[in-house]
């Protein structure tokens, strides 16, 4: 196993419909044809994987169905997006990127990206 | 709250084996940085082995090198120390530890850490 550079913005602020939205970039050594991403998060002392996807290189990343992620892949870059997000899914989200196929597999783990999730006040009752 | 639960120590003769495990309870170890530690009576504790986040890299003190192996099974939610080739001066408790480190250093393993288990006795003794 290997190890290689990915890169990730530091912050991001969801917006108010719970969207976030941020670039994963990895530093590929080799033409890789396999790529699997994963999104993990860092909160309170524990990480839980957010969503994963494998992608052949050209082709569209596709996550599960029922998957709070969505991404679309150019080169060496990966342009995710995750739903769904409330005040208390804040944390650091991690991009985990890993080579899988041909050999040799590499493994590269961004330093996180801090989302902001605020939720948006309710409106207030109108009088008619 | 995530707690370290220690377990596999034992008499055993010199020359034996043993594998200690190192169980989370309350949570899991995924990434974390975990280490092993021992303490023999009237001596200071010193680190044995580590092993990263990641599980890429793994450290052993010179008087283990080759006897002692660290290895974990995110599945299992438990790391291991394997100890081959055990001699009188093994004789210890053993602690498990863990930290959960910044993602910039879940290859590497931790300076300090902040969860501490309860130990398991090794005594190697003919």
């Known amino acids: 196993c290997k190890a290689m550079h990915v890169a990730q913005p530091a912050v991001v602020l969801a917006s108010s419909r719970g969207i976030a939205s941020f670039v994963c970039e990895y530093a590929s050594p080799g033409k890789a044809t396999e790529v699997r991403v994963t999104v993990l998060r860092q909160a309170d002392s524990q990480v839980t994987e957010v969503c994963a996807a494998t992608y052949m290189m050209g082709n569209e990343l596709t996550f599960l169905d029922d998957s709070i992620c969505t991404g679309t892949s150019s080169g060496n870059q990966v342009n995710l997006t995750i739903q769904g997000l409330r005040a208390m899914d804040t944390g650091l989200y991690i991009c985990k990127v890993e080579l899988m196929y041909p050999p040799p597999y590499y493994l590269g783990i961004g330093n996180g990206t801090q989302i902001y999730v605020i939720d948006p006040e309710p409106c207030p009752d109108s009088d008619f | 709250e995530v707690q370290l639960v220690e377990s596999g120590g034992g008499l055993v003769q010199p020359g034996g084996s043993l594998r200690l495990s190192c169980e989370a309870s309350?949570?899991?170890?995924?990434?974390?940085?975990i280490g092993w530690f021992r303490q023999a009576p009237g001596k200071e504790r010193e680190e044995v082995s580590c092993i990263s986040g990641t599980g890429l890299r793994t450290n052993y003190a010179d008087s283990v090198k080759g006897r002692f192996t660290i290895s974990r099974d995110n599945s299992k939610n438990t790391v291991y120390l394997q100890m081959n080739s055990l001699r009188a001066e093994d004789t210890a408790v053993y602690y498990c530890t863990g930290k959960l480190l910044h993602p910039s250093l879940w290859s590497a393993c931790a300076n300090e850490y902040d969860l501490w288990g309860q130990g398991t006795q090794v005594t190697v003794s003919s």
């Open positions: 309350g949570g899991t170890l995924d990434y974390w940085s």
